[in-house]
């Protein structure tokens, strides 16, 4: 806490500029008007303030806006955002995607901090759902964002937003999350033709039921082994040898390398040896 002291003569700040970097902490507290700071927040990032000086500026904004900063200030916080606590951020009402982008840019290249997580939560709750533009922005900054959400939170993702999802965004999703996302993806991509549909739906297939895998097997999709290995075991088990052969296409020979791993192992054990022998891979049920 900086002690309240009168501003020395001639030091009263008329604008936020580089001369302020030479001010001691107490001088910043005494000589910089909080309202001036709020209107010229965009200048703060261009000035090499020390962490201690930034603490003073934050304190001034906190005093001016005890109920939480307005968006006009939040949008220009820049590196001052790193000084905010989750408790500070919970007071904010962030509605502009531009504001969100500006603050995510500050944290770019780092793990998602509690501050960023709180900011995103506030933003999404304010919007009511994860729309396409928001999802596009969040996954661009944090590819694992989608998989950090609970199945309940994912249920608020509208099918239209699925178009923004890239394969790498789903890398860390577990089966429960894919169970929620797959039906949305199926709906989102339903008007695409066979091969284009498969390219888009492939990353979500960890949530696909048996009947959808059977349907895909009739479409010359040539599913690769990496995708097959991520399918739900309960969805794979009812597939026949012929269906798996058609589903995998040329990739079917990769079953031999994966015969000890799930879901391949469990699937092999469910098949008749005569049927497995038709593959010519030497798979033993």
């Amino acid at each position: 806490e900086v002690e309240k002291t009168a501003c020395p003569s001639g030091k009263k700040a008329r604008e936020i500029d580089e001369s302020l970097i030479f001010y001691k902490k107490w001088e910043l507290e005494a000589c910089v008007d909080a309202a001036l700071l709020a209107t010229q927040m965009d200048r703060v990032n261009a000035i090499p303030f020390t962490y201690e000086q930034l603490d003073v500026l934050k304190h001034k904004l906190d005093e001016l806006y005890p109920q939480g900063y307005p968006e006009s200030v939040i949008q220009h916080l820049g590196y001052l955002f790193l000084k905010m606590s989750p408790e500070d951020i919970r007071k904010w009402n962030v509605t502009s995607l531009e504001t969100l982008k500006a603050l995510l840019e500050v944290n770019k290249g780092h793990e998602m901090s509690p501050q960023v997580a709180t900011l995103i939560d506030r933003f999404v709750k304010g919007r009511g759902q994860l729309d396409k533009d928001t999802l596009d922005t969040l996954t661009a900054f944090y590819p694992g964002y989608l998989c950090s959400l609970s199945p309940e939170e994912l249920s608020s993702v509208p099918p239209s937003s699925i178009w923004a999802v890239r394969p790498q965004d789903l890398d860390t999703c577990d089966p429960r999350q894919l169970d929620v996302l797959y039906p949305k993806a199926r709906l989102a991509f339903q008007n695409m033709n066979g091969s284009e549909y498969f390219v888009k739906i492939q990353s979500f297939l960890g949530g696909a039921p048996t009947e959808d895998l059977k349907a895909l097997s009739q479409q010359n999709v040539s599913m690769d082994l990496a995708t097959f290995m991520k399918l739900r075991t309960d969805a794979v088990l009812p597939l026949t040898v012929a269906e798996v052969q058609k589903l995998l296409g040329p990739h079917v020979e990769g079953l031999k390398a994966e015969e000890r791993h799930r879901p391949v192992r469990d699937w092999i054990l469910r098949q008749r040896q005569d049927d497995l022998d038709t593959l010519g891979l030497g798979l033993q049920g």
Partner: antibody, heavy 115, light 108 residues
Amino acid sequence: EVQLVESGGGLVQPGGSLRLSCAASGFNIYSSSIHWVRQAPGKGLEWVASISSYSSYTSYADSVKGRFTISADTSKNTAYLQMNSLRAEDTAVYYCARYYAMDYWGQGTLVTVSS
Amino acid sequence: DIQMTQSPSSLSASVGDRVTITCRASQSVSSAVAWYQQKPGKAPKLLIYSASSLYSGVPSRFSGSRSGTDFTLTISSLQPEDFATYYCQQGPYYHPITFGQGTKVEIK
């Protein structure tokens, strides 16, 4: 994206040796068979050799048996074709391909055996 | 080793024609037969695998069938980009592979 890139071709004298490489990306060669196929100038396709790393299986065409050796380094995701005692009739573009149903092929590397 | 005898070695056809190429195996074989298309200076491209399965992304005018030891590639309506050389190939897993001699499809 799946890609196969051959290298190591060139001009060699009869009786000489060459080692061709097939660098794979976008998939794991451990769980895939890799094949070498050659094509002499103006001629058709001729299978040369196959390897399945996961089952330690190798196979050769009669025309190269005892002279060529196929191998794979799964840590480098690369397959090789060591060609010894080369003959004029081995002159060809050499392709590597993935799977028995060869869904991806490299661009090919030219091997010329001539004195 | 199994031989694959491909016929004809060349044929002339017009755009829109139905084209059929046949490969006969020298002995009983499994359905592990594939068909490839190759254009000059390029690597072959897979069209059909397992005798009759259309490879992903290949136009549906291409089809494959089997009758005993005879394997057939059919192009239902020849397109300008289909003029090329076609090869059949047999090779069940863990067996030697053999290619047919090739069929060159030329413009009439």
